[in-house]
């Protein structure tokens, strides 16, 4: 499978909410012996490999934010995270998963990475990620709502194996 990032850049005004999205592209095995883990973190554009460094999102580490479920299930982060940190991570039945950040500030600007780990029980795991940029703007040049910029087809199907 691959991870697509439908949008490579999100430009938002301060105070707005934004939902960053990644999508699993098939074939996705939905057998009983397959488990998917998904998480989010901030990173920097490394010279060797983007998304190798894992920084917290609003004081939550990649470990804190991970979701896990079988191929058929949807999942959400806890109410606690939404309330305390203005974050909500979600995943649906169709391979879409996202993180919603509420009440954006300039400090939220940066590179965000989604990570998917597919584990086949008694077999090796497969790990892929996607990256996207969030720019939070303030002042007269800031947009009134979030503006999203589609990824090029090459970028949006970027695959990084373990």
């Amino acid at each position: 499978f691959k991870v697509a990032t439908p949008y490579s850049l999100y430009v938002c005004p301060e105070g707005q909410n934004v939902t960053l999205t990644c999508r699993l592209l098939g074939p996705v095995d939905k057998g009983h012996d397959v488990t998917f883990y998904k998480t989010w973190y901030r990173s920097s554009r490394g010279e060797v490999q983007t998304c190798s460094e894992r920084r917290p999102i609003r004081n939550l580490t990649f470990q804190d934010l991970h979701l896990h479920h079988g191929g058929h299930q949807a999942a959400n982060t806890s109410h606690d995270l939404a309330q305390r940190h203005g974050l909500e991570s979600a995943s649906d039945h169709h391979g879409n998963f996202s993180i919603t950040m509420r009440n954006l500030t300039l400090l939220d600007s940066g590179l965000y990475c989604c990570l998917v780990v597919e584990i086949r029980h008694h077999h090796s795991e497969h790990r892929v990620h996607g990256a996207m940029e969030l720019q939070v703007q303030t002042g007269k040049d800031a947009p009134s709502n979030c503006v999203v910029y589609p990824s090029s087809s090459q970028d949006s199907e970027n695959i990084t194996a373990a």
Partner: antibody, heavy 118, light 111 residues
């Protein structure tokens, strides 16, 4: 879900020894993994931690002599120039020890004893 | 980060209350990444409290944690014989050198 340490044994001063933490039932990709040690009758001492594809972070005293590395199912702790003061039980721990979801994420191995003696 | 734990030992009668303090040299990550562990001889530490004040599953409600930033407290009410153990605080500062540290431990002796 479990973690288990191995490789502890009696060695002489100056030896290099590698301990291995073998995990089962979960993916290392989603967790920090830490090493902690405890000398006989003493307190707990953090050595360092790492995550898949990322850097390892160490206690100041461990930097340079201890190295943490990972494979897909193991986390290794390489210790060089061992001294009598390194005699301890070494624990492998899933998480960063003060985890946001302690109930979900915190998991300790039983420990492996390293004895350094001439 | 450096965690300073007091007292180093405490002897208490059954039914009494024990208070253990832990002071961080700087604020722990997000002001709340502080855990308390209980350890008995020959066993790995057992998590009691996470995120400063959250009780781990299976831990009696006699145990409670409080504090934020650099000052934290573990309280054991109505102490029973089984509480005799050594208690440690652990703080996480972030992904850096000395990013995690344990307190020196508090031995609780139940009379």
């Amino acid at each position: 879900q479990s973690v288990e340490e191995s490789g502890g044994r009696l060695v002489t001063p100056g030896t290099t020894l590698t301990l291995t933490c073998t995990v089962s039932g979960f993916s290392l990709s989603l967790y920090y993994m830490s090493w902690v040690r405890q000398a006989p009758g003493k307190g707990l001492e953090w050595i360092g931690m790492t995550y898949t594809g990322g850097s390892a972070y160490y206690a100041s005293w461990a930097k340079g002599r201890f190295t943490i590395s990972q494979t897909s199912t193991t986390v290794d702790l390489k210790m060089t120039t061992l001294t009598v003061a390194d005699t301890a039980t070494y624990f492998c721990v899933r998480g960063y020890l003060a985890d946001y979801y302690g109930d979900r994420d915190n998991l300790w191995g039983p420990g492996t004893l390293v004895t350094v003696s001439s | 980060i450096v965690m300073t734990q007091t007292p180093s030992s405490k002897s208490v009668p059954v039914g009494d209350t024990v208070t253990i303090n832990c002071q961080a040299s700087e604020s722990v990550f997000s002001d709340d990444r502080l855990a308390w562990y209980q350890q008995k001889p020959g066993q790995p530490p057992k998590l009691l409290i996470y995120r400063a004040s959250n009780l781990a599953s299976g831990v009696p409600s006699r145990f409670s944690g409080s504090g934020s930033g650099t000052q934290f407290t573990l309280t054991i009410n109505d102490v029973v014989c089984d509480d005799a153990a050594t208690y440690y605080c652990a703080g996480y500062k972030g992904d850096s050198t000395d990013g995690v540290a344990f307190g020196g431990g508090t031995e609780v002796v139940v009379k």
